[in-house]
Amino acid sequence: HTAAQDNCTCPTNKMTVCSPDGPGGRCQCRALGSGMAVDCSTLTSKCLLLKARMSAPKNARTLVRPSEHALVDNDGLYDPDCDPEGRFKARQCNQTSVCWCVNSVGVRRTDKGDLSLRCDELVRTHHILIDLRHRPTAGAFNHSDLDAELRRLFRERYRLHPKFVAAVHYEQPTIQIELRQNTSQKAAGDVDIGDAAYYFERDIKGESLFQGRGGLDLRVRGEPLQVERTLIYYLDEIPPKFSMKRLTA
């Protein structure tokens, strides 16, 4: 009788089914929806998490101005196709044979087309800008304290290497977190910035993906940091391809 059998759950992903039938009675976990094996020592890929979510029952510091090529996820939830490693497939289609190309965080980066649409490669999102507005407080947060707390959060809770948190900007009440990670910078075992941003987004919404952990309790020098709005911008290594009609709409 092993420790794995006593506590066969996935600490980093509650949207899993686990059983102690791995080698030597080890706990083996698979993602809901896809049935794919999940590494419970790190974050699960956003693609597998979205698939699991769709299978579940329905329920003078200046701020950065997002580039003209920045994408916002306006399409909402969909049931994605994931590759054998759990990444988004470059082309996604719905049940009515409408297809589109996505980036590495699963956000649409082309106009929608039909089954003849080609998406030659999965384009990497190398820069993510998380734009938050916090609820009113007695005074502004100290910028360096805020910076340190958010960096600690991404390092400890999401296991994101500190070098990928490029900057934290603050102009009360707006906080911006910049994550940067080029293909060449990402080593084997590194958490992907897209996955970290998705876990953070779900935490902020009070929908934590972690098993049995309390919700996110963000505090700066003991003062609660409560977020009332979140916007996330995604910048790809290759700019998206939308028609002018969409851009002028």
Partner: nanobody, 121 residues
Framework: QVQLQESGGGMVQVGGSLRLSCAAS????????MSWVRQAPGKGPEWVSY????????YYPDTVKGRFTISRDNAKNTLYLQMNSLKPEDTAVYRC??????????????WGQGTQVTVSS
């Protein structure tokens, strides 16, 4: 990138034997734990053997214990699965996988395309 290529599958009679091979590249094979995983039509994947990096530790589920033997040749970057006394229920696609074993958890993170094994009575 990680590549795993299986070979040696085929059709065999009940009670027969097969030896599967898996050629690995794109990662330090000699420091990686490995497994064989199978998937029968309409069923989920099931691990059938595990071997640690230096080959000193192996595990098998009860369904194949005593019939299957996993081994590896780190000099050749190759993983093997010797399957004896085959039964119809062993029919499946067999994939080799890079694996990770901790004190509490087991996971595979890369898989080959697989090789079909069919046991006919």
């Amino acid at each position: 990138q990680v590549q795993l290529q299986e070979s040696g599958g085929g059709m065999v009679q009940v009670g027969g034997s097969l030896r599967l091979s898996c050629a690995a590249s794109g990662f330090p094979f000699s420091s990686a734990d490995m497994s064989w995983v199978r998937q029968a039509p309409g069923k989920g994947p099931e691990w059938v053997s595990y071997i640690n990096a230096d080959g000193s530790k192996t595990y098998y589920p009860d369904t194949v214990k005593g019939r299957f033997t996993i081994s590896r040749d780190n000099a050749k970057n190759t993983l093997y699965l010797q399957m004896n006394s085959l039964k119809p229920e062993d029919t499946a696609v067999y994939r080799c996988a890079r694996a990770k074993l901790t004190d509490t958890h087991y996971v595979e993170d890369y898989w080959g395309q697989g090789t079909q094994v069919t046991v006919s009575s």
